[in-house]
């Protein structure tokens, strides 16, 4: 199971990196286009990965003004990078009953980023609890 647990660790590192990136972007909310974006909240169990992909697909945009433009766009690019695959992620990809991205309430960038962080924290918590209980599924 060594390679499996290494994959899990890579996944955890990536999710924590994503939280850092979200926190970084929150510093620049005034430099983001004030567009309303689908922002999943209170995501039902087993739909976390579906909601995660909604956050990644959202068209978060820099206002392209001032000297923060490059930092913001690099951070947005980092947010969209695919995380290492996990068994739970693979399983959830086959689930067809999760809400579509458009069905989620739309929020401005500040709340969008807060909700994204909240989902990432939930996914990390689930991941840790599943490992504590001896499962390597999530």
């Amino acid at each position: 199971h060594k390679s499996s647990s290494q994959g899990q660790d890579r996944h955890m590192i990536r999710m924590r990196q994503l939280i850092d990136i979200v926190d970084q972007l929150k510093n620049y909310v005034n430099d983001l286009v004030p567009e309303f974006l689908p922002a999943p909240e209170d995501v039902e169990t087993n739909c976390e990965w579906s909601a995660f992909s909604c956050f990644q697909k959202a068209q978060l945009k820099s206002a392209n003004t001032g000297n923060n433009e490059r930092i913001i766009n690099v951070s947005i690019k980092k947010l969209k990078r695919k995380p290492p695959s996990t068994n739970a992620g693979r399983r959830q990809k086959h689930r067809l009953t999760c809400p579509s991205c458009d069905s989620y309430e739309k929020k401005p960038p500040k709340e969008f980023l807060e909700r994204f962080k909240s989902l990432l924290q939930k996914m990390i918590h689930q991941h840790l609890s599943s490992r504590t209980h001896g499962s390597e599924d999530s």
Epitope: N67, E69, R70, I71, N73, K77, K80
Partner: antibody, heavy 119, light 111 residues
Framework: EVQLVESGGGLVQPGGSLRLSCAAS????????MDWVRQAPGKGLEWVAE??????????YYAESVKGRFTISRDDSKNSLYLQMNSLKTEDTAVYYC??????????WGQGTLVTVSS | DIVLTQTPLSLSVTPGQPASISCRAS??????????MHWYLQKPGQPPQLLIY???NLESGVPDRFSGSGSGTDFTLKISRVEAEDVGVYYC?????????FGQGTKLEIK
């Protein structure tokens, strides 16, 4: 393995034009931010131009020294990056490197192609 | 434009001894805890290779005798024990904003 291979360099007279190409492989080119960086003989590195990914709508950016004369472009279907250089000056003489800007820093570089502008 | 000034412009080091290169920016390249400064080594006849990104992060595959530090306007690249293969020109580069600029380079040679 990531590979970037430049071509199109050569000798050109002042005022002339040249088109550089860069063939990319080993990574998802359409997602990449690509840049040209040049190095005059015996000198340091100078950033020339950048083109971002399809997801960013391919915006382009230029150093002041080449603005209005050089055009960076890409063809994602061919995994290729280009630099069209017009109104060339002697000070444009340099090795031109094709590079991938991967989040923080130029991670991958080609071997470079030499452009000589001389009469 | 942010101007990067490297010192010294050249240094000669005995193998096994440490080396240090400084890079000073004309304005801060740090913001909200991140420092947008990177270091490269260009070996003779080769393109540059990334050594350190975001001031202190070692690029994958780079020996851990290389380290970076600093924030704001002052940055340092250190080599704990110089080896023969470390010869070449070292450049700092910022990505705080466009245009991206490089330092003028520091040539390292072996005594």
């Amino acid at each position: 393995e990531v590979q970037l291979v430049e071509s199109g360099g050569g000798l050109v007279q002042p005022g002339g034009s040249l088109r550089l190409s860069c063939a990319a492989s080993g990574f998802t080119f359409s997602d990449a931010w690509m840049d040209w960086v040049r190095q005059a003989p015996g000198k340091g590195l100078e950033w020339v131009a950048e083109i971002r990914s399809e997801a960013d709508n391919h915006p382009t950016y230029y150093a002041e020294s080449v603005k209005g004369r050089f055009t960076i472009s890409r063809d994602d279907s061919k995994n290729s990056l280009y630099l069209q250089m017009n109104s060339l000056k002697t000070e444009d003489t340099a090795v031109y490197y094709c590079t991938e800007y991967d989040y923080e820093g130029f991670v991958h570089w080609g071997q470079g192609t030499l452009v000589t502008v001389s009469s | 434009d942010i101007v990067l000034t490297q010192t010294p412009l050249s240094l000669s080091v005995t193998p096994g001894q440490p080396a240090s290169i400084s890079c000073r920016a004309s304005k801060s390249v740090s913001t909200y805890g991140y420092s947008y400064m990177h270091w490269y080594l260009q070996k003779p006849g080769q393109p540059p290779q990334l050594l350190i990104y975001l001031a202190s992060n070692l690029e994958s595959g780079v020996p851990d005798r290389f380290s970076g530090s600093g924030s704001g306007t002052d940055f340092t690249l250190k080599i704990s024990r110089v080896e023969a293969e470390d010869v070449g020109v070292y450049y700092c580069q910022h990505s705080r904003e466009l245009p991206l600029t490089f330092g003028q380079g520091t040539k390292l040679e072996i005594k």
